[in-house]
């Protein structure tokens, strides 16, 4: 699509995965395309097949190694190419010089659990997954709580401006069902974005004791 708009967006999970999305106006759904990754200072290269995710959008994951292995550093540059089959040949559609630590999106936090719950408050903890040791403590979190009768979009965002893998939710209503989600973002990187939201953790506050409010 010479005059159409295309977009090639990739993110590094900080360990061993680069996830890419390629979209192009007017492209055929059954077009066969791939992403090729060529690092400037590594012996390996990697390819993934772009699979359709919507009408004119394809996605794939470049698996660089074992999930917790540190495959790239801040000095690496990976040349990413989108190649699509046209008849008998592969045609280069897009090229990006990819700086992994400028384009970070971590995995969603995992292992959410209720540490302690009362009538009006709940303490919740979580863990980060496949996050590079390079970050040390340079991470931030956002959390949100789903109250009855509301949507996730309506939930106010709670910001934790440091690497704090727990939160104490307060001013909750007794004997009420809630859901909780958290996401993480490194402070590093011009194009870095928030991780996906964690799987929701459902919890229920304790009922108020008869005759008194705890």
């Amino acid at each position: 699509a010479v005059n159409g708009t295309s977009q090639f967006t990739c993110f590094y999970n900080s360990r061993a995965n680069i996830s890419c999305v390629w979209s192009q106006d007017g492209a055929l759904q059954d077009t066969s395309c791939q992403v090729h990754a060529w690092p400037d200072r590594r012996r390996w290269n990697q390819t993934c097949e772009l699979l359709p995710v919507s009408q004119a959008s394809w996605a794939c994951n470049l698996i660089l190694g074992a999930p917790d292995s540190q495959k790239l550093t801040t000095v690496d540059i990976v040349t990413l190419r989108v190649l699509c089959r046209e008849g008998v040949r592969w045609r280069v559609m897009a090229i990006q010089d990819f700086k992994p630590f400028e384009n970070l999106r971590l995995m969603a936090p995992i292992s959410l659990q209720v540490v302690h719950v009362e009538t009006h408050r709940c303490n919740i903890s979580w863990e980060i997954s496949q996050a590079s040791h390079y970050f040390e403590r340079h991470l931030e979190f956002e959390a949100r709580t789903l109250s009855p009768g509301h949507t996730w979009e309506e939930a106010p965002l709670l910001t934790l401006k440091q690497k704090q893998e727990w939160i104490c939710l307060e001013t909750l209503t007794p004997d009420t069902q809630y859901e909780f989600q958290v996401r993480v973002k490194p402070l590093q990187g011009e194009f870095t974005t928030w991780s996906p939201w964690s799987q929701p953790l459902a919890f229920r506050t304790k009922p108020a004791a008869l005759g008194k409010d705890t």
Partner: nanobody, 123 residues
Amino acid sequence: EVQLVESGGGLVQAGGSLTLSCAASGRAFSNYPVGWFRQAPGKEREFVAAITWLSGSTLYADSVEGRFTISRDNAKNTVYLLMSSLKPEDTALYFCAAALKTITRGQNDYSYWGQGTQVTVSS
């Protein structure tokens, strides 16, 4: 904001050569990949070639592959288009353009544009 200024256009005989320059200034220009496009009278603007800054990876239109060479000089913040074996159908206004991250053949993928330099190839 990124500013792009093309130069090097002119009149040349068929079979001859010409080198166009695209000088850039502005915010962190060395992060932006650059493409060349051209527009002949009465025709749509078309992709010619593009290059990434860091790896120097290149992309060419089929019509110029093997005849044109795109290159860059990072120290001078300049991209060049060496045009050889020129044909009358290469006559056009040549534009350079900067993309944010990715080079493609689509003009809508480029965010910053120069004013153009005229190339005329006589038979």
